[in-house]
Interface confidence: medium
């Protein structure tokens, strides 16, 4: 038994051109978390079910809001290690998948939304008990830097965590070819391999190849419970008449293992052996494939023929997210030009244009003066989505159809008298004043 530990050092834009935009924005702050999935490094033909060695989910990282104009930095990460406990021997060769997820913290209906930002995978050789191994993986334009190691949980030691070390009361010296288990413990054991199939719960061995049973168990592999006197079952309360143990409900009664899993009892509970493609305590979990219809809102599923391979959803216009589960607010991109009003009708986008503009996106500036005549010698002036007439002297109004009284505004200064004339107006100035408007 032992623990696989993963330390994420940084996640951010990789080197080179095409650096990604920050996954968070001022409008939509977000935070990251990571998921690791481990599989024993078997050949493809004998591929195990997903995450057969185990999986772990990190805590959420700090909330991050993009600073407009600033380059996308390495994003703030969750604290602590991702730890994947393993119960059996460490396989030495393993495959990993590390997923970077984004949790958006905007005002979504139904709480925060999650989407997969990046997924990296690889196969590595690693001995338990060794130093931290460093790695850099790229997924598209993103770069993930991390370290990992496998360590044994006491009393297990060794490169596969299969040797058991117990401290000795009396000091002893190790024989040739044998080393002490650990600096503080003075037992020198060779790798101990019990008889194949020996029950890990009810059997143990002190010599390679043997299988000795714990109290209450028997059989060559310690899988048979010992019966009391002539009674058939070791379980349940004692019968007053016979003194025998009456069969009680066992943890495997009714088979708690789903999806064709087989149940075997353990001292405290039960254990399910799951068929290929299923995992979990009761074999109640399986990977997602395109056959499960994971792409919503008419998205097209590609790849993912079996649970070990990833699928990708190609979303129809108006939807996004790893499963096309999120509707895009297409009006937020401000597609309507020249002040047009955007309407997202679901199946299509419409722009309601201001006067003087037309086109699907209000991109055409209409000729405001087309078909518009100004009367009485006025000239049409275009602009602002509406036409305007510059009228000849003596005329006014929108189309220069109204006869204007040039004296109505009292244009003659210093008490001068105004007279309307066919060519405009004439000011008769009071004594001592002169000029076209008696202004001098």
């Amino acid at each position: 038994a032992g623990v696989f530990e993963l330390q994420i050092h940084s996640f951010g834009p990789g080197p080179g051109p095409g650096a990604p935009r920050s996954p968070c924005s001022a409008r939509l702050p977000c935070r990251l978390f990571f998921r690791v999935c481990l599989k024993p490094g078997l050949s493809e033909e004998a591929a195990e079910s997903p995450c057969a060695l185990g999986a772990a989910l990190s805590a959420r990282g700090p909330v991050y809001t993009e600073q407009p104009g600033a380059p996308a930095p390495d994003l703030p990460l969750p604290d602590g290690l991702l730890q994947v406990p393993f119960r059996d021997a460490w396989p030495g060769t393993f495959s990993f998948i590390i997923e970077t997820w984004r949790e958006e913290l905007g005002d979504q209906i139904g709480g925060p939304a999650w989407s997969l930002l990046a997924r990296v995978a690889g196969r590595r050789r690693l001995a338990a008990g060794g130093p931290w191994a460093r790695d850099i993986q790229r997924a598209g334009a993103w770069e993930l830097r991390f370290s990992y190691r496998a360590r044994c949980e006491p009393p297990a030691v060794g490169t596969a965590c299969t040797r058991l070390c117990r401290p000795r009361s009396a000091p002893s010296r190790c024989g040739p070819g044998l080393r002490p288990c650990a600096p503080l413990e003075d037992e020198c054991e060779a790798p101990l391999v019990c008889r194949a199939g020996c029950s890990p719960e009810h059997g143990f061995c002190e010599q390679p190849g043997e299988c000795r049973c714990l109290e209450g168990w028997t059989g060559p592999l310690c899988t048979v419970p010992v019966s009391t006197s002539s009674c058939l079952s070791p379980r349940g309360p004692s019968s007053a008449t016979t003194g025998c143990l009456v069969p009680g409900p066992g943890p495997c009664d009714g088979n708690p293992c789903a999806n064709g899993g087989s149940c075997s009892e353990t001292p405290r509970s039960f254990e399910c052996t799951c068929p290929r493609g299923f995992y979990g305590l009761r074999c109640e979990v399986s990977g997602v494939t395109c056959a499960d219809g994971p792409c919503f809102n008419g998205g097209l599923c590609v790849g993912g023929a079996d649970p070990d391979s990833a699928y990708i959803c190609h979303c129809p216009p108006g939807f996004q997210g790893s499963n096309c589960e999120k509707r895009v607010d297409r009006c937020s991109l401000q597609p309507c030009r020249n002040g047009g009003l955007c309407l997202d009708l679901g199946h299509a986008l419409r722009c309601r244009c201001r006067a003087g503009f037309a086109g699907p996106r209000c991109e055409h500036d209409l000729d405001d003066c087309a078909g518009r005549a100004c009367a009485n010698g006025g000239t049409c002036v275009e602009g602002g989505g509406a036409h305007r007439c510059s009228c000849a002297l003596g005329f006014g109004g929108r189309d220069c159809r109204e006869r204007a009284d040039p004296c109505a505004a009292r244009p003659c200064a210093h008490g001068g008298r105004c007279y309307a004339h066919f060519s405009g107006l004439v000011c008769a100035c009071a004594p001592g004043y002169m000029g076209a408007r008696c202004e001098f």
Epitope: W114, S286, D292, E325
Partner: nanobody
């Protein structure tokens, strides 16, 4: 921890109706889509129906017009109303939650439906 438990299966004559129910705990309905699968003896598991967040529904061609899936978020249940049942509908029916945050399917234990002619 997601847990799914089916009920409502049983034996019935062809042409009859059954309503399967799935009690779902630990399921976030805006992050998971609920479905029903079935597995006939000696055959693979097939998707019968799915209800997506927002209420969109999917039905296999073989059950369209006869089966209806519904979801009661307040009671944490998903139901499959099966009408005009046929002998070929005989199978073990499984409740399913496809949760895309974890990118996994969760399964119930199954409930047996037997339709005799």
């Amino acid at each position: 921890q997601v847990q799914l438990k089916e009920s409502g299966g049983g034996s019935i004559q062809a042409g009859g109706s059954l309503r399967l129910s799935c009690a779902a705990s630990g399921v976030s309905y805006n992050r998971c889509s609920m479905g029903w699968y079935r597995q006939a003896p000696g055959k693979g598991r097939e998707l019968v129906s799915r209800i997506q967040p927002g209420g969109n529904t999917y039905y296999a061609d073989s059950v369209k017009g006869r089966f209806t899936v519904s979801q009661d978020n307040a009671k944490n249940t998903v139901s499959l109303q099966m009408n005009s049942l046929k002998p070929e509908d005989t199978a073990m029916y499984y409740c399913n939650a496809l949760c895309w945050r974890e990118n996994v399917n969760y399964w119930g234990q199954g409930t047996q439906v037997t339709v005799s002619s």
